[in-house]
Interface confidence: low
Amino acid sequence: MMTGTIETTGNISAEKGGSIILQCHLSSTTAQVTQVNWEQQDQLLAICNADLGWHISPSFKDRVAPGPGLGLTLQSLTVNDTGEYFCIYHTYPDGTYTGRIFLEVLESSVAEHGARFQIP
């Protein structure tokens, strides 16, 4: 039975050219996290494997940095980075938990750098 909950940074916004940290946190379960995948729509951005460590997709190596923790830092943001991001926690014995973050990259300086955690 899956009892865990994924908490995420929710809907966030950032300025073009800036950076943003995508964060997810798995709580309310004692399941072991074996791997976390970060995906943008249908693209795999990065993997953090409990045994092997981080792997960043070569397409994003210039703009994606691992961490902090199991999070992901996006740098040199462009308007094209606007969209849904997913953290996919592979756990044993529970299975897979998925969290969703929506990032909006704004041209102007009105972006709010929210760091709140929301449960979707």
């Epitope: 795999l44 494997n49 092997l52 981080w54 792997h55 190596k61």
Partner: nanobody
Framework: EVQLVESGGGLVQPGGSLRLSCAAS????????MGWFRQATGKEREWVAS???????WYADSVKGRFTISADNSKNTAYLQMNSLKPEDTAVYYC?????????????WGQGTLVTVSS
């Protein structure tokens, strides 16, 4: 130190196929991803494809649907199956490993194998 040896290059007609191999030896216990890159004459080296131990694969847009990367962990060998080859695929192809070191960059390089696509 890891040593990488590529093979399988050659001359092929447009639309043809080739299979490149990359054999790794040395301190291979920290090899967690293998990648293929290429460098055409007068151009910068560009990433082509990579495979993570466990099977995840990535491809450059220019080769998606035509190239397939794979790895045989038991043989410490990576492969690049290249189909529907085009003249613009002509280049020296290099394999490299990603070790999850501090840099996250591919290193070291093999000596390369030349692929020529021409009629």
């Amino acid at each position: 130190e890891v040593q990488l040896v590529e093979s399988g290059g050659g001359l092929v007609q447009p639309g043809g196929s080739l299979r490149l191999s990359c054999a790794a030896s040395g301190s291979i216990d920290r090899i967690n991803a293998m990648g293929w890159f290429r460098q055409a004459t007068g151009k910068e080296r560009e990433w082509v494809a990579s495979v993570l131990r466990g099977g995840y694969t990535w491809y450059a847009d220019s080769v998606k649907g035509r190239f397939t990367i794979s790895a045989d962990n038991s043989k410490n060998t990576a492969y690049l199956q290249m189909n529907s080859l085009k003249p613009e695929d002509t280049a020296v192809y290099y394999c490299a490993r990603d070790s999850y070191s501090t840099s996250f960059w591919f290193d070291p390089w093999g000596q390369g194998t030349l692929v020529t696509v021409s009629s």
